[in-house]
Interface confidence: low
């Protein structure tokens, strides 16, 4: 059967019908419905929302909608022993305490079950000691402290500002520096954009607002107690002592009003340079400890949170493919929120809901996609991508054989300036072609394509006339699909102007003030940006599921592989003497990249010419495209990170949110000048070059003519 026979009407008409069915008003209505109460993972409220979504997806017309449950480790504050930080005097009296909750936003004063700000998975503890200010607690910040300023964090409580890197990396760095506790805070320099009012009068963070979040270092493991396997009814669970990625020191987040009280008394060393100063009226002294009159005062943390194995629920909807039902295109986003989830995740969940409704409408009219589409509402993303990872662990054998692509659908907006896309190079051409067909929602670009406004506002740093597309990192539910299983993945959302707004994320991220009103009043009153994101995400899913030949271009992988090889070579060449001494050569990698480029080019030529009416040949060519991403997976994983198995991309070891290219080589080279055994360190560099070169060559060979 050809695609057209299976689907009644022409593919182009199908796509138009699908996109025309998406309505901004519906997304608005769904967002309102999903944000009236908190939906914290593991709570009854979130279970009820799962059942509601299951019921509505069935009504929309999906073939089946099931709940998939798992019992995973979650973390909650102790209701009777609130977490807080105090300043204590020499007699041990608490002379200042941080606030126990955020002042609720107008209209939400009587809502119950708002979880107070906490750092999920912090161990219990009541450490006390002197404070050290560690800037963003990045690797380079601790290098500056320990190596340049000779400040020892051992036995100290460190205070770090949120931003720049994933909070779990901050905590890991603090632990490695010997700290006995971590205080995280939001500095106005990062979470208060100039010229904008605080919520409820604008989209800025008020002084009492606090960012929640997990502080795990899971490295892709999923549930900390069942790494590699689903947390099902017969799971063998590790003891808490052996759990993956749990922090070993207490951690707690605060707002900038409370941070002011701690930082204003700081003594010790002055900040090393202006990059360590935020926007509070404090000296940003590094410490350790308080100044002069206050030098006998200490900081004490009171953390009583508990880790509990709790049931979570994913919603999995299926729209069966007419021609290739055993090929899966997945659209997934999470449902659990820290509080109301006005942006994260419900601006994404509302878009997924509308995409399901549109696909369902087409199905009711007799249409089916060529390939099966799976829709997922993930649980417990905020606690470490747990719902998506457990489901993928349970279904890994099916996914690695049948998974065509995964499109992520968390927050649809983090601003309203332009589009932001992170994806595998295989999807570059799909994204370019799709955005050329969509209308831009941006002011000043009426009648112009989305591609045009996106390229103008966010140009590619390498290619003139093209938009920037970034590497996939982590911190969201695509992680297991891309980094572990090697399924081609992508994500899209509307973002801010990074040139003029240097704050990290959006100011109200993970706070109680992330409400429906925040979106409706300040970010997207007409829901036109949400609609555009629905068109991009939905359009990508449509094309991936319905095009006769998969819309992947392997030549784009060849281009980036050369770019990444050049980049890692130039990093290594900062050590020319050592490269000579230890005979370090990148020849094998460059040779493999050259081979990949040539083979990809020939494959693309064959792709233009082959007989698409021959279902066996069509399937063969599509399988070569589908399995190309899989070919970059090393079954042994990266050093010390067994669940990060993609050789070309991994989350940065210094910032989970960021993607790193040739991560094995990059990590082997990182800070190599400080390694105690240079021979061993350069030996590891050589081993990683070998692994990368072999993998690129092996992937190239999957594109060769099969016989």
């Amino acid at each position: 059967k050809s695609s057209n026979e299976a689907t009644n009407i022409t593919p182009k008409h199908n796509m138009k019908a699908f996109l025309d069915e998406l309505k901004a008003e519906n997304i608005k209505k769904f967002l309102y419905n999903f944000t009236q109460i908190p939906h914290l993972a593991g709570t009854e409220q979130n279970f009820q929302l799962a059942k509601q979504i299951q019921s509505q997806w069935k009504e929309f017309g999906l073939d089946s909608v099931e709940l998939a449950h798992y019992d995973v480790l979650l973390s909650y504050p102790n209701k009777t022993h609130p977490n807080y930080i105090s300043i204590i005097n020499e007699d041990g009296n608490e002379i200042f305490n941080t606030s126990l909750f955020e002042p609720p936003p107008p209209g939400y004063e009587n809502v119950s079950d708002i979880v107070p700000p906490f750092s999920a998975f912090s161990p219990q503890g009541m450490p006390e000691g002197d404070l050290v200010y560690v800037n963003y607690a990045r690797t380079e910040d601790f290098f500056k402290l320990e190596r340049d300023m000779k400040i020892n964090c051992s036995g100290k409580i460190v205070i770090a500002r949120y931003g720049k890197v994933f909070r779990g990396n901050k905590v890991k760095n603090a632990q490695l520096a010997g700290a006995k506790g971590v205080i995280l805070y939001s500095d106005p320099a990062d979470y208060f954009a100039p010229g904008v009012k605080s919520y409820p009068d604008g989209w800025n963070l008020p002084g009492g607002g606090v960012q929640r979040g997990n502080i795990l270092n899971l490295n892709g493991a999923g549930d900390p107690l069942t790494p590699g396997y689903p947390a099902n009814e017969y799971a063998y669970r590790r003891g808490i002592a052996e759990a993956v990625g749990l922090p070993s020191i207490p951690v707690h987040p605060i707002g900038y009003y409370d941070a002011q009280k701690l930082l204003e008394k700081m003594g010790g060393s002055a900040p090393p340079d202006s990059s360590w100063r935020g926007s509070l009226k404090v000296p940003y002294n590094v410490g350790p400890g308080f100044t002069g009159n206050f030098s006998t005062q200490k900081v004490k943390m009171h953390i009583h949170s508990t880790n509990e194995v709790t049931r979570i629920y994913n919603v999995i909807g299926t729209l069966r493919g007419a021609v290739e039902p055993d090929r899966y295109v997945i659209l997934g986003g999470h449902r659990d929120s820290w509080v109301f989830g006005g942006i994260d995740p419900q601006s994404g969940a509302a878009v997924v809901h509308e995409i399901v409704r549109s696909f369902g409408t087409l199905k009711k009219e007799g249409w089916r996609p060529r390939r099966t589409i799976l829709f997922a509402s993930w649980d417990a993303e905020e606690f470490g991508l747990l719902g998506s990872t457990e489901w993928a662990e349970e279904n890994s054998r099916l996914l690695q054989e049948r998974g065509v692509a995964y499109i992520n659908a968390d927050s649809s907006i983090e601003g309203n300036y332009t589009l932001r896309v992170d994806c595998t190079p295989l999807m570059y051409s799909l994204v370019h072609n799709l955005t050329k067909e969509l209308k831009s929602p941006d002011e000043g670009f009426e009648g112009k394509s989305l591609y045009e406004s996106w390229t103008k506002k966010s140009p590619s740093p390498e290619f003139s006339g093209m938009p920037r597309i970034s590497k996939l990192g982590s911190g969201n539910d695509f992680e297991v699909f891309f980094q572990r299983l090697g399924i081609a993945s992508g994500r899209a959302r509307y973002t801010k102007n990074w040139e003029t707004n240097k704050f990290s994320g959006y100011p109200l991220y993970h706070s109680v003030y992330e409400t429906y009103e925040l979106v409706e009043k300040f970010y997207d009153p007409m829901f036109k940006y949400h609609l555009t994101v629905a068109q991009v995400r939905g359009g990508m899913v449509f094309e991936l599921a319905n095009s006769i030949v998969l819309p992947f271009d392997c030549r784009d992988y060849a281009v980036v592989l050369r770019k990444y090889a050049d980049k890692i070579y130039s990093i290594s060449m900062k050590h020319p003497q050592e490269m000579k001494t230890y005979s370090v050569s990148f020849d094998s990698l460059f040779s493999a990249v050259k081979n990949f480029t040539e083979i990809a080019s020939k494959f693309s030529e064959r792709l233009q010419d082959f007989d698409k009416s021959n279902p066996i040949v069509l399937r063969m060519m599509n399988d070569q495209l589908m399995f190309l991403e899989r070919a970059f997976i090393d079954p042994l994983g990266l050093p010390d990170r067994p669940f990060y198995r993609h050789v070309i991309y991994a989350p940065s070891s210094h910032n989970k949110y960021a993607g790193e290219s040739f991560p094995g080589i990059y990590d082997a080279l990182f800070d190599i000048e400080s390694k105690v055994d240079p021979s061993k360190a350069w030996g590891e560099v050589k081993r990683q070059i070998y692994v990368a070169a072999f993998t690129v060559q092996a992937a190239a060979e999957t594109l060769s003519e099969v016989a």
Epitope: Q124, G125, M126, P127, K172, Q175, L176, R238, G239, A241, E242, V244, G245, S248, H304, D640
Partner: antibody, heavy 116, light 107 residues
Framework: EVKLEESGGGLVQPGGSMKISCVAS????????MNWVRQTPEKGLEWVAE??????????HYAESVKGRVIISRDDSKSSVYLQMNSLRAEDTAVYYC???????WGQGTTVTVSS | NIVMTQSPKSMSASAGERMTLTCKAS??????VSWYQQKPTQSPKMLIY???NRFTGVPDRFSGSGSGTDFILTASSVQAEDLVDYYC?????????FGGGTKLEMK
């Protein structure tokens, strides 16, 4: 069956050094944090040191009484944990037990005697 | 350092009797308390962890309770082989510390 077997104890002079070892079996050693605990009739049970697993960056912690004089280490390939003791004092005389986190399994102990 | 104080230092019991040992922490240690039994010439063995959870293979006559600063180990019906030394210990914070022990003797 979980087994922990210490070795390497004996007589050493004050100021001297000694390295004691513990070999584990019956469980996935690399996943577990390991401790050394010592016991004397005078002081009873006293925790000495802890080393965490690879997923916790092999973090180490020490009792104040031994800090700077002892080093705990592990070799996951040999399922072994070690305690290198330097600048030994008479008060370090004790039976040294290797224990698995949270002290839920103990070895039979090895005796270290510091005396001239 | 957190001091764990056990009482009594020694006590007498007859077979079949109920025994109660107490352990007091100098500051709040949540439920991060374990109880150990040590027989002559042997190493300590865990009886209770997390203040109230029986460790694998421990007879159900042993039970633990308490949280915060006050903890109790109970043997509902003492057997002859139970007349040995018992220690409590905390793993709430560094350094981990143990009580001085209670010696249980034959009446």
């Amino acid at each position: 069956e979980v087994k922990l077997e210490e070795s390497g104890g004996g007589l050493v002079q004050p100021g001297g050094s000694m390295k004691i070892s513990c070999v584990a079996s019956g469980f996935t050693f690399s996943n577990y944090w390991m401790n050394w605990v010592r016991q004397t009739p005078e002081k009873g049970l006293e925790w000495v040191a802890e080393i965490r697993s690879q997923s916790n960056n092999f973090a180490t912690h020490y009792a104040e009484s031994v800090k700077g004089r002892v080093i705990i280490s592990r070799d996951d390939s040999k399922s072994s944990v070690y305690l290198q003791m330097n600048s030994l004092r008479a008060e370090d005389t004790a039976v040294y037990y290797c224990t698995r986190r949270w002290n839920n399994f103990w070895g039979q102990g090895t005796t270290v005697t510091v005396s001239s | 350092n957190i001091v764990m104080t056990q009482s009594p230092k020694s006590m007498s019991a007859s077979a079949g009797e109920r025994m109660t040992l107490t352990c007091k922490a100098s500051e709040n240690v949540g439920t991060y308390v374990s109880w150990y039994q040590q027989k002559p010439t042997q190493s300590p063995k865990m009886l209770i962890y997390g203040a109230s959870n029986r460790f694998t293979g421990v007879p159900d006559r042993f039970s633990g309770s308490g949280s915060g600063t006050d903890f109790i180990l109970t043997a509902s019906s003492v057997q002859a082989e139970d007349l040995v030394d018992y220690y409590c210990g905390q793993s709430y914070t560094f350094p981990y510390t143990f009580g001085g022990g209670t010696k249980l003797e034959m009446k």
